[in-house]
Interface confidence: low
Amino acid sequence: LEEELQVIQPDKSVLVAAGETATLRCTATSLIPVGPIQWFRGAGPGRELIYNQKEGHFPRVTTVSDLTKRNNMDFSIRIGNITPADAGTYYCVKFRKGSPDDVEFKSGAGTELSVRAKDLCNFNEQLEN
C-alpha cells in the first residue's frame, strides 16, 4: 500500500560545543505531498522559525543536500556558530502546497539541541550576552 509521508528526525538529541556547527537531521519518506519543509525551534504558536525552504534569509543555516532537486527527500540542516542561546528542541515540519498559503502537513518528533560550553567562564559570559 502507498505509505503516507512520514517526517523522520532520527536523533532525539544532539550535543554540540559552543562555537561549533550543529547538524539536525530530517528525512521525508515520500515525495507526496508536494510542499516545502520548515524548521522551527519549539512548538506551538510561539515557535521560532529557523529555516524556510521556500523563502527568507537564514545566514547561519545551510542545507546538507540540494533542496532545489525536485526528488530530494533529505531536509537536514546545519546551524553554524552555536551558542547556549540556541539550545532547545528543533522540529522539521513538512507543509503541503496550498493556495494562497501552504498548510502544515506533518512534523517530525523533534531533536533536542544541547550546547556544551568550552569552559564555564565562557558559558556564563555567553548566557549574559
Partner: nanobody, 118 residues
C-alpha cells in the same frame, strides 16, 4: 515494468477545455499516488498536481480551480480535466506514479502534447 500511456492532447483555443488520460500498467495502480507534470518547449519540467490512493488531490497554484485530476481504479487510468486553458498551458503533459520527479527521463510515457492557440 511500469508502463504509462498518455493521450487526449491536441490543439485548443484559449478558454477551451481538454481531458487527458493516463493508462497505467505494471504496478499496483489503485494503491499508488499519481501525478501529472508538464514540460513546455525549452523549459524544465513543472509539476501540475497529484491524486492520492483515496482520491484526494493537490494542485500547483497556477492550475488550481481550472484543472481537475481524477482516477478510475477499475480501468487503471488517471485523468486530467483542463478548463479555461491559456497559451501558457501549452506543453507536453506526462503522468507518473508517486511524486515529483527530477526530469522527463523518469517517465516511461511519451507524454501528450497540448497546444493552446487561436
Amino acid at each position: 515494468h511500469v508502463q504509462l500511456v498518455e493521450s487526449g492532447g491536441g490543439l485548443v483555443q484559449p478558454g477551451g477545455s481538454l481531458r487527458l488520460s493516463c493508462a497505467a500498467r505494471g504496478f499496483s495502480f489503485r494503491d499508488s499516488a499519481m501525478s501529472w507534470a508538464r514540460q513546455a518547449p525549452g523549459k524544465g519540467l513543472e509539476w501540475v498536481g497529484a491524486i492520492y490512493s483515496d482520491g484526494s488531490t493537490v494542485y500547483e497554484k497556477s492550475v488550481k480551480g481550472r484543472f481537475t485530476i481524477s482516477r478510475d481504479n477499475a480501468k487503471n487510468t488517471m485523468y486530467l480535466q483542463m478548463h479555461s486553458l491559456k497559451p501558457e498551458d501549452s506543453a507536453r503533459y506526462y503522468c507518473a506514479p508517486k511524486g515529483v520527479v527530477a526530469d522527463e527521463g523518469d517517465y516511461s510515457g511519451q507524454g501528450t502534447l497540448v497546444t493552446v492557440s487561436s
